[in-house]
């Protein structure tokens, strides 16, 4: 029994961010006359939260009119709560000193915890494509949650991965946390159209997880394959040598003939036709006039995909016999090979 | 129940120290502060001062220079001493409990005189 | 210091009446809402014995004949109505300034 207390109800009051918290107190004598104060923490650091003496408090109210007579209730509302709120709120109550006001009797204290969000999480992939069959990795970033407790899955295409890391900061206390995360995800051809997801949940979220999400468009880079054939045409001493381009992504892409290793024509893929995975694929033809070459002709298509080093495939065009008609296929022997 | 009582010497020499012990029981004094009041015979009462339960002190500015106000909390005593007194100085000493001087001792009479 | 100055000095009343003694202070003893003046009622051979707190609360045990009133400067202890062993000294003391200081006391007696 003391002849002032100070009953600071509740040990622990949890509110959403951007919500008013409410923090409790009752004194159970209004003798010493002298002042109530609410603190934020303890010992020669706390911080004045109001002082029902003098000052100016915006963000504070107090739940009953102190002002009114044999009023006894020291409650107070904080309004618009971040995480940077948290922390035991101490209801102390002073008694007129000569000169200074004299600290008389605190509260238990009442320990205010900030729920708070998740923001949306971010995720980034590598800075550079890759192409299938390697390994990339991708970070997820979510930041300015509380309490520290949350959970982080990795998706691609609706399946969950498994090869991840995850932490969370700070590892001590504090007000608000981050969690960063570094997922694995192996490249196939296929993945064009892919996503990788972030998924994260956290109490505040209500069971509607958030999520961030990446395209492997961003990422991967599929070369193409070549395919340089020869047809007749209905003029006599003409062949078109097509080069086929398939499977390729990004689409920027230059193509260049070579006659015997000199250029013959550039061009940049524009109509391009796309397959169901995403990828593209071009073609593009080359009418050689036969009768303007004494000897066999090498021709190449070179391409250039996406600034990567150039890939071609070269077919050799005998002019030791002409075609005769069309359809005809003897006029030429087709001995393509790759070179890069 | 609450109980206070006054006790010390009833006559004391002018110039000498007046010493009087206030012993409570059924309060802590570490939860309560002690008042001292006095009352010259046929007058009015005087507040001496507060010794609060921190053990922080407060006293009447009339009477600060010589007054002073200490507790053995483990003996449930509180103590008033009167330093250089007068014949101005005789009165009943009474200890009274808390700032609201809800429990009040019987009082001890103290007289001055050589 | 704050002057309680208290009037009547003396007064008589007969049982059944109404008995009225005003404390007035030479300066406010209002802090925080609240009046911190209390009334102490005090017999012959007798410590003083608390009646109202605050203006105008009633001490436990207190009949409630007893009734204070007041802010401010200007505070009232009436009896309502008197009766005989109401006789005593009465006085008003404020603790909202140091040093803490009571009235000169009105003395009620019975006719």
């Known amino acids: 029994e003391e002849e002032l207390q100070v009953i600071q109800p509740d040990k622990s009051v949890l509110v959403a961010a951007g919500e008013t918290a409410t923090l409790r107190c009752t004194a159970t004598s209004l003798i010493p006359v002298g002042p109530i104060q609410w603190f934020r923490g303890a010992g020669p650091g706390r911080e004045l939260i109001y002082n029902q003496k003098e000052g100016h408090f915006p963000r504070v109210t107090t739940v009953s009119d102190l002002t009114k007579r044999n009023n006894m209730d020291f409650s107070i509302r904080i309004g618009n709560i971040t995480p940077a709120d948290a922390g035991t709120y101490y209801c102390v109550k002073f008694r007129k000193g000569s000169p200074d006001d004299v600290e008389f009797k605190s509260g238990a204290g009442t320990e205010l915890s900030v729920r708070a969000k998740p923001s949306a999480p971010v995720v980034s992939g590598p800075a550079a494509r890759a192409t299938p069959q390697h390994t990339v990795s991708f970070t997820c970033e979510s930041h300015g949650f509380s309490p520290r407790d949350i959970t982080l899955k990795w998706f691609k295409n609706g399946n969950e991965l498994s090869d991840f890391q995850t932490n969370v900061d700070p590892v001590g206390e504090s007000v608000s946390y981050s969690i960063h995360s570094t997922a694995k995800v192996v490249l196939t051809r296929e993945d064009v159209h892919s996503q990788v997801i972030c998924e994260v949940a956290h109490v505040t979220l209500q069971g509607d997880p958030l999520r961030g999400t990446a395209n492997l468009s961003e990422t991967i880079r599929v070369p193409p394959t070549l395919e340089v054939t020869q047809q007749p045409v209905r003029a006599e001493n003409q062949v078109n040598v097509t080069c086929q381009v398939r499977k390729f992504y990004p689409q920027r892409l230059q193509l260049t003939w070579l006659e015997n290793g000199n250029v013959s024509r550039t061009e940049t893929a524009s109509t391009v036709t796309e397959n169901k995975d995403g990828t593209y694929n071009w073609m593009s033809w080359l009418l050689v006039n036969v009768s303007a070459h004494r000897d066999d002709v090498k021709l190449t298509c070179q391409v250039e995909h996406d600034g990567q080093p150039a890939v071609s495939k070269s077919h050799d065009l005998k002019v030791s016999a002409h075609p005769k008609e069309q359809g005809s296929n003897t006029a030429a022997e087709n001995t393509g090979s790759n070179e890069r | 129940q609450v109980q206070l009582q006054e006790s010390g010497p009833g006559l004391v020499k002018p110039s000498q120290t007046l010493s009087l012990t206030c012993t409570v029981s059924?309060?802590?004094?570490?939860?309560?502060?002690v008042n001292w009041i006095r009352q010259p015979p046929g007058k009015g009462l005087e507040w001496i001062g507060i010794?609060?339960?921190?053990?922080?002190?407060d006293y009447n500015s009339a009477l600060k220079s010589r007054v002073t106000i200490s507790k053995d909390t483990s003996k449930n005593q509180v103590f008033l001493k009167l330093s250089s007194v007068t014949a101005d100085d005789t009165a009943r000493y009474y200890c009274?409990?808390?700032?609201?001087?809800?429990?009040w001792g019987q009082g001890t009479t103290v007289t001055v005189s050589s | 210091d704050i002057v309680l100055t208290q009037s009547p000095a003396s007064l008589a009343v007969s049982p059944g009446q109404r008995a009225t003694i005003t404390c007035r202070a030479s300066?406010?003893?209002?802090?925080?809402?609240?009046?911190?003046m209390h009334w102490y009622q005090q017999k012959p051979g007798q410590p003083p014995k608390p009646l109202i707190y605050l203006a105008s609360n009633l001490e436990s045990g207190v009949p409630a004949r007893f009734s204070g009133s007041g802010s401010g400067t200007d505070f009232t202890l009436t009896i309502n109505p008197v009766e005989a062993n109401d006789a005593a000294n009465y006085y008003c003391?404020?603790?909202?300034?140091?040093?803490?200081?009571f009235g000169g006391g009105t003395k009620v007696e019975i006719k």
């Open positions: 003391q404020q603790n909202n300034e140091y040093p803490w200081t």
């Open positions: 009274a409990r808390a700032g609201k001087m809800d429990y």
């Open positions: 059924g309060f802590s004094l570490t939860g309560y502060g």
């Open positions: 010794i609060w339960g921190d053990g922080s002190t």
């Open positions: 300066e406010s003893v209002d802090s925080y809402g609240n009046s911190f």
